[in-house]
C-alpha cells in the first residue's frame, strides 16, 4: 500500500491576512484565524512529518479584500509560490480581471500548474494562453507519480468576466477523456481538482470513470467527522464518500472558505492504484499555530502599500451620500441607490442577445449601510469612506428566487416597521409602494421589476411563479435579519464579490456621482 | 506557442562526447523543470537526466551517473547535456521535455511539452 496526504484549500478569497473567526478582519490578534503564514506553519509541519504530501487549492484565490484590489493577483502568485502549492484549479473569480488579469499575474507568474479541463481557448486567445494553464498534471510524489485533472464552474462567464474566447464545458463530458488519457500514460492515482460547488464535486465523484478522489470548492463547503472545533456546521462527513456508477468508494472533500481550515485527507492506495482507505478532517488555523515568521515578514512588506491605496481618491460626488440609519432604515436613501447601481453594474454580461442583461435586480438591506459620506470634503471618495459605509467585508452575490420569495421578502422589509430595524430593503431593478395601515404581511400592494428579457428595460408586475436573478448582500442570502425565506427558498446561489471592491470599481469608472431619491420605494394608504 | 528544439545529435565513436542543447521558445524556462529522456529503436522512452527550476536540483538515471551533465542557462532560455564516455547503448533519439513544477523526476508522464528529438549514433 502506498499513502497521499491531500493538503487542501479552496475559496480563500484574498485572505492572505489572519482574520477574525468570521472571516472578516482581524481584530484582537490572540483570538485570529487563517492566513498564509500561519498556514505555512502547519503545511510545513505535515510535509517534515508525512512523506507523500501534496498541497491542492481548488479555485477562487482571487476576490474578496483590499489584498485584490491593490495587487490584482500579483499576491496570489508570490504567495503560493512561496507556500510550494503543488496545483490549482481555476475558479470563477480568477477571470474577476478578465483573461489579461488571470495570465498575466497568475497564469505567467505561478511556478505550480494551473488547471481545468472543461475550459477551452478559441479564436486568437488559443495560441495566447496554450500552456499557461492545462487539462491535468502528472505530479511526481515519492517513487510515484499523481495525477490531478481540474474543471471550473461552466456558471463562469455569468458570475465572471471570462470573455468570449474562452467555452466553459460541461464538466463531466470534459473530464472522462482527459481522465482516459491519463489512464493511458499508466498514471493510476487520479485526483478531480475543481471549482464547480459540492454537488458537482459528488456528481464527478459518481459519473467519471477512473477518478480516485475529488478535492471541491466553490460553495464553501464545510465537512467534518466528530465534533467541529468552530462555528461551521458540517453538511456531512469528511470526507464524503460517494459511491460510484462503477461500484468505487469515492471521498469528497472541501475546506470550508477564506483560509479559515487547511483540508487534510490520507488515501491509502493499493499497488494498482486502487482507494483502500480514507479518512481526515480540515485542520483549524487558530492562534495555537503561530505564524511563520519569514511569511509574516512579507506580508508585513507588501501591507504597506495597501495603507497607501486606502486614502487615495477613487472619485467625487457631488451630492451627500445618505447613508445615515435614519434614511436607509425608514425610506429610500441615495446611498442605497448608489450601492445597488454598482451592484447590478457590476453584474452587466451580456451572454445572450435576447436579454439585455442576465439580472436587473439589486435588494440591500438598510442596516448594512453603516455611514453617510458627506460631499464638503471637496467631494473625495476614498476606500477609507467605503470601508465605514460597508464594514463587514461582506460580498454581493447573485441568488436565483421564485417572485413568491422575493414577495415574501418585502413583507418581511416592513413588517415591523418604524423601529429602525436593519431588514428595511433599499432596491434597484424593483418599485415597491408599501401601505403600511395594512397589517404586518400584508403590506406590499406594488411590486414591479425591471425586465430582463427586453431590449428596452421596464417595469412589469412581479410574477409570483417565475424565477428571477437577483443581486444581493451574502448576509441576505444566508438568511440574516430575519430573511430566512431567502436561504430557504433560493433556487441557486454563487458568491459574488467583494462589497467595498464593487462600489469602489463603480465610482472609479463613474469618476463623479450624484445618487438621487427617485422613486423606488413608495408608501400609500388606501386602497388599490 | 511553447516549443523545444533539440540539437547538438550525430555520430560519435565510443569513449568520445557530445553536448546537446535543448533551446526553448515561447516561454521563459525559470519556471519550468527540463528533462532529457532516449528512446532506442524498439524501447521505450526514458528518462535521463533533469534539472529542476526551484533549486536547479539535478537528478541522473543510473546508467549515465557520473558520465553525463545537465545544466540549464537561463539568460539563454537553453539546457544542455554534456555526455561523456559515451557508450553504443547510449545509441538513441534523444528528446527534452518540459514541465512547470518545482521539482523534476524521470517519469515521462511528468512532462507536459516535447521537443522532436535528436539522433545520437555511438558506433565505431
Known amino acids: 500500500a502506498w499513502e497521499l496526504t491531500i493538503l487542501h484549500t479552496n475559496d480563500v478569497h484574498s485572505r492572505l491576512e489572519q482574520t477574525s473567526e468570521d472571516s472578516s478582519k482581524c481584530v484582537n490578534a490572540s483570538r485570529c484565524m487563517g492566513g498564509v503564514a500561519r498556514l505555512f506553519t502547519k503545511v510545513q509541519q505535515i510535509r517534515r512529518a508525512e512523506p507523500n504530501v501534496l498541497l491542492l487549492d481548488a479555485g477562487d484565490q482571487y476576490q474578496g479584500t483590499i489584498w485584490f484590489t491593490v495587487y490584482k493577483g500579483a499576491e496570489v502568485a508570490h504567495f503560493m509560490n512561496a507556500l510550494r502549492y503543488d496545483a490549482m484549479a481555476l475558479g470563477n473569480h480568477e477571470f474577476d480581471n478578465g483573461v489579461e488579469g488571470l495570465i498575466e499575474p497568475l497564469l505567467k507568474e505561478a511556478k505550480f500548474p494551473i488547471l481545468s479541463a472543461n475550459i477551452k481557448a478559441k479564436g486568437p486567445l488559443a495560441s495566447q494562453i496554450s500552456g499557461l494553464y492545462l487539462p491535468y498534471k502528472v505530479l511526481p510524489v515519492g517513487d510515484e507519480v499523481v495525477g490531478i485533472v481540474g474543471y471550473t464552474s461552466k456558471e463562469t462567464p455569468f458570475l465572471s468576466n471570462p470573455g468570449t474566447n474562452l467555452v466553459f464545458e460541461d464538466e463531466i463530458t470534459a473530464l472522462q477523456p482527459e481522465v482516459d488519457k491519463l489512464k493511458t500514460l499508466n498514471v493510476n492515482k487520479i485526483i478531480a481538482l475543481g471549482h464547480s460547488g459540492f454537488e458537482m464535486d459528488k456528481l464527478i465523484a459518481q459519473k467519471v470513470r477512473g477518478v480516485d478522489v475529488v478535492v471541491g470548492g466553490h460553495s464553501n463547503t464545510f465537512l467534518y467527522t466528530g465534533n467541529p472545533p468552530s462555528k461551521e456546521v458540517p453538511a456531512g462527513k469528511y470526507p464524503f464518500i460517494v459511491t460510484s456508477d462503477d461500484g468505487r468508494k469515492v471521498p469528497v472533500v472541501q475546506a470550508y472558505a477564506f483560509g479559515k481550515y487547511l483540508g487534510y485527507l490520507k488515501i491509502e492506495f493499493d499497488e494498482r492504484g486502487n482507494v483502500i482507505s480514507s479518512h481526515g478532517n480540515p485542520i483549524l488555523l487558530n492562534s495555537s499555530i503561530p505564524e511563520d515568521p519569514s511569511i509574516k515578514a512579507d506580508i508585513n512588506k507588501w501591507r504597506i502599500k495597501l495603507d497607501n491605496y486606502s486614502t487615495q481618491e477613487l472619485g467625487k460626488t457631488i451630492v451627500y451620500l445618505d447613508g445615515s440609519s435614519q434614511s436607509c432604515r425608514f425610506r429610500e436613501c441615495n446611498m442605497g441607490n448608489l450601492i445597488c447601481d454598482a451592484m447590478i453594474n457590476n453584474n452587466l454580461r451580456h451572454t445572450d442577445e435576447m436579454f439585455w442583461n442576465h439580472v436587473s435586480m439589486c435588494i440591500l438591506n438598510g442596516g448594512g449601510i453603516r455611514s453617510p459620506i458627506d460631499e464638503r470634503n471637496n467631494g473625495t471618495i476614498t476606500w477609507e469612506n467605503l470601508a465605514a459605509v460597508l464594514p463587514f467585508g461582506g460580498t454581493f452575490d447573485l441568488v436565483q428566487l421564485k417572485g413568491s420569495t422575493l414577495k415574501k421578502a418585502f413583507e418581511h422589509s416592513v413588517h415591523r416597521y418604524g423601529q429602525s430595524t436593519g431588514e428595511f430593503l433599499q432596491v434597484g431593478g424593483i418599485h415597491v409602494v408599501y401601505d403600511l395601515s395594512r397589517k404586518p404581511g400584508d403590506r406590499v400592494v406594488k411590486l414591479d421589476v425591471l425586465c430582463t428579457k427586453c431590449r428596452v428595460p421596464s417595469y412589469d408586475p412581479l410574477k409570483m411563479d417565475e424565477v428571477y436573478k437577483v443581486i444581493l448582500p451574502n448576509f441576505l442570502a444566508n438568511g440574516g435579519d430575519g430573511f430566512q425565506m431567502i436561504k430557504d427558498e433560493l433556487l441557486r446561489h454563487d458568491s459574488g464579490d467583494q462589497d467595498i471592491n464593487v462600489v469602489s470599481t463603480y465610482i472609479s469608472k463613474m469618476k463623479v456621482i450624484y445618487p438621487a431619491v427617485e422613486g423606488r420605494i413608495k408608501f400609500s394608504t388606501g386602497s388599490h | 506557442q511553447l516549443q523545444l528544439v533539440e540539437s547538438g545529435g550525430g555520430l560519435v565513436q565510443p569513449g568520445g562526447s557530445l553536448r546537446l542543447s535543448c533551446a526553448a521558445s515561447g516561454f521563459t524556462l525559470d519556471y519550468y523543470n527540463i528533462g532529457w529522456f532516449r528512446q532506442a529503436p524498439g524501447k521505450e522512452r526514458e528518462g535521463v537526466s533533469c534539472i529542476s527550476s526551484s533549486e536547479g536540483s539535478t537528478y541522473y538515471a543510473d546508467s549515465v551517473k557520473g558520465r553525463f551533465t545537465i545544466s540549464r542557462d537561463n539568460a539563454k532560455n537553453t539546457v544542455y547535456l554534456q555526455m561523456n564516455s559515451l557508450k553504443p547503448e547510449d545509441t538513441a533519439v534523444y528528446y527534452c521535455?518540459?514541465?512547470?513544477?518545482?521539482?523534476?523526476?524521470?517519469?515521462?508522464?511528468?512532462?507536459?511539452?516535447w521537443g522532436q528529438g535528436t539522433l545520437v549514433t555511438v558506433s565505431s
Open positions: 521535455a518540459a514541465d512547470r513544477y518545482y521539482y523534476c523526476s524521470l517519469h515521462v508522464s511528468q512532462y507536459d511539452y
